[in-house]
Interface confidence: low
């Protein structure tokens, strides 16, 4: 449905609230760098534009691209050289290059200070001085900082934001009102943006086929009772929204979702029991709900998979008459069974069923090469149970921290060229799988575990990408996306690695440590657990547990001090002392 | 983006010496190991010499032991391969690599090394 001017036709779809919203976090996650103002005046001047376009189409330049009328507005910026470097290159190209430059500029681990939370009612304050200000201040800060957070999702955020504001600032106890509802959504933040970066670098560095074979696996263990098509029509619009929100094209990513939500309520006898709740709501909230809804209950009666895809005389003809097709309905059949895999697991079966039917549909007795393929399933099935089952033990038996520790000492062992911010960061996260996995029954265990896992080894993924210092790491990121886990699993220490030389540096600690929040101070902690196995990568767990030990006592103890910068000087000499006797360093 | 630019190759007779050398860009340069990897005609990359961070730790192939010397100038972004008593066996392309790698980092050529009379 072409109009006559793209950018008139969303300003009418999304309203002027979400239109300015969407452009705000666009131009954020492209020009990461630029002070908060320089990107609000350029939202105004957009807007404004749209303006003119709704009131005449016909209207100069109302007629061009989005990408070409916001590329312009970005390549106007004064200190684009100065503050981007070669990003300043990208102006010069024409659309469509051009937008595929300033995405591959994006940054993931951008330079920027650490977002530092005010007193609660400095926050009020400027939030009852001017709201609108404030809250596009939140998008444009987590929009720079998280350049593929899924723009829809985002709006989602700030409008929780503004609510926990609203009531929080009213309140009898401010802080005890606010600071909860403040972590919430700091952490889910955190988790949608690592979620949604997984579904960007499937697009981008698989393709489209990668993701669509995920979208199929999710929405048919989440719909088990909807028909293969009407799966296949939600996996093509899911596919559409995706693509133009990680491609930069937030104003038609935020109206196709629109779109589907609409359509899914309007659907939902043929989709999902589960759904009724989530279409009562408004559309932000809506869409939120629907992305996030339980599976429904799996349809009583359905046969054995063996008839259609291994006892069948047809398995070959179907396959070389529409392969994508039969091979998405053989994961479509057994995720709907299973709810109880992980999507990468459903992944991997489909590409060894896949393998299979290459290899045996050209064998002189194709039945009988593969009559045999769903015994080829069971170790890969069983892989993943054994490891989740060890490791919720481990976590059982260690407590989140220690489990973390211990993730920090395999992770640095395996890949200690990656930096110790990084390694710390990726440990923790790949860590938290205990608290947020562990709990459940068996049969959700696997799917919660393991496409966590993903989600978590993909940050590892970008991050090593922008400076890359491992071949293990390129390795495992890019050889295949849903064995991307079994390869770090299966990676054993790295004999190849020259530990780093001891740095007392690196382990002088100050008073400062003993005003930090317990999440920091397990940081710092942890940070030293990192470079003491880089600098001895065959010490034992024994020793390092003993110097860890030392350690805590020592940041205890010196805490406890009347003079703390004294202590932590003097016992910090002999705990260097004594660690490089217990490490033989 | 990561630049690694080898230079200092070129065409010397059995026994003579080279120094190669990598300028480093792109990264910091001083966090990090760095190897120095050689690919002959027709065989697949073999590592030559790594060296830690700070440049107090080192390693060599069997190959090249006590003929070839690594090592870096943090200051410069700079790393360095000392090649003496060169055989026709060291003639290959060398190329600098983050870490302990023998893929390259960067978008370098690496440098060639010809030795033969």
């Known amino acids: 449905d072409a109009h006559k001017s793209e950018v008139a036709h969303r300003f009418k779809d999304l309203g002027e609230e979400n239109f300015k919203a969407l452009v705000l976090i666009a131009f954020a996650q492209y020009l990461q760098q630029c002070p908060f103002e320089d990107h609000v005046k350029l939202v105004n001047e957009v807007t404004e534009f749209a303006k003119t376009c709704v009131a005449d189409e016909s209207a100069e330049n109302c007629d061009k691209s989005l990408h070409t009328l916001f590329g312009d507005k970005l390549c106007t910026v004064a200190t684009l050289r100065e503050t981007y470097g070669e990003m300043a290159d990208c102006c010069a190209k024409q659309e469509p290059e051009r937008n595929e430059c300033f995405l591959q500029h994006k940054d993931d681990n951008p330079n920027l200070p650490r977002l530092v939370r005010p007193e609660v009612d400095v926050m009020c304050t400027a939030f009852h001085d001017n709201e609108e200000t404030f809250l596009k201040k939140y998008l444009y800060e987590i929009a720079r900082r998280h350049p593929y957070f899924y723009a829809p999702e985002l709006l989602f955020f700030a409008k929780r934001y503004k609510a926990a504001f609203t009531e929080c600032c009213q309140a009898a106890d401010k802080a005890a009102c606010l600071l909860p509802k403040l972590d919430e959504l700091r952490d889910e933040g955190k988790a949608s943006s690592a979620k949604q970066r997984l579904k960007c670098a499937s697009l981008q560095k698989f393709g489209e086929r990668a993701f669509k074979a995920w979208a199929v696996a999710r929405l048919s263990q989440r719909f088990p009772k909807a028909e293969f098509a009407e799966v296949s029509k939600l996996v093509t619009d899911l596919t559409k929204v995706h693509t133009e929100c990680c491609h930069g094209d937030l104003l038609e990513c935020a109206d196709d979702r629109a779109d589907l939500a609409k359509y899914i309520c309007e659907n939902q006898d043929s989709i999902s029991s589960k759904l009724k709740e989530c279409c009562e709501k408004p559309l932000l909230e809506k869409s939120h709900c629907i992305a996030e809804v339980e599976n429904d209950e799996m349809p009583a009666d359905l046969p054995s998979l063996a008839a259609d895809f291994v006892e069948s005389k047809d398995v070959c003809k179907n396959y070389a008459e529409a392969k994508d097709v039969f091979l998405g309905m053989f994961l479509y059949e057994y995720a709907r069974r299973h709810p109880d895999y992980s999507v990468v697991l459903l992944l991997r079966l489909a590409k060894t069923y896949e393998t299979t039917l290459e290899k045996c549909c050209a064998a002189a007795d194709p039945h009988e090469c593969y009559a045999k393929v769903f015994d080829e399933f069971k170790p890969l099935v069983e892989e993943p149970q054994n490891l989740i089952k060890q490791n919720c033990e481990l976590f059982e038996q260690l407590g989140e921290y220690k489990f973390q520790n211990a993730l920090l000492v395999r992770y640095t062992k395996k890949v200690p060229q990656v930096s110790t911010p990084t390694l710390v960061e990726v440990s923790r996260n790949l860590g938290k799988v205990g608290s947020k996995c562990c709990k459940h029954p068996e049969a959700k265990r696997m799917p919660c575990a393991e496409d966590y896992l993903s989600v978590v080894l993909n940050q590892l993924c970008v991050l090593h990408e922008k400076t890359p210092v491992s071949d293990r790491v390129t390795k495992c990121c890019t050889e295949s996306l849903v064995n991307r886990r079994p390869c770090f699993s299966a990676l054993e220490v790295d004999e190849t690695y020259v530990p780093k030389e001891f740095n007392a540096e690196t382990f002088t600690f100050h008073a400062d440590i003993c005003t930090l929040s317990e999440k920091e101070r397990q940081i710092k902690k942890q940070t030293a657990l990192v470079e003491l196995v880089k600098h001895k990568p065959k010490a034992t767990k024994e020793q390092l547990k003993a110097v860890m030990d030392d350690f805590a006592a020592f940041v205890e103890k010196c805490c406890k001090a009347d003079d703390k910068e004294t202590c932590f000087a003097e016992e910090g000499k002999k705990l260097v002392a004594a660690s490089q006797a217990a490490l033989g360093l | 983006e990561v630049q690694l630019l080898e230079s200092g190759g070129g065409l010397v007779q059995p026994g003579g010496s080279l120094r190669l050398s990598c300028a480093a860009s792109?990264?910091?340069?001083?966090?990090?190991?760095m190897s120095w990897v050689r690919q002959a005609p027709g065989k697949g990359p073999e590592r030559v010499s790594a060296i830690s961070s700070d440049g107090s730790g080192t390693i060599y192939a069997d190959s090249v032991k006590g003929r070839f010397t690594i090592s870096r100038d943090n200051s410069k972004n700079t790393l360095y391969l000392q090649m003496n008593s060169l055989r026709p066996e060291d003639t290959a392309v060398y190329y600098c690599?983050?870490?302990?790698?023998?893929?390259?980092?960067?978008p370098g050529q690496g440098t060639l090394v010809t030795v033969s009379s």
């Open positions: 690599t983050i870490g302990s790698s023998t893929t390259p980092s960067g």
């Open positions: 792109g990264f910091t340069f001083g966090q990090f190991g």
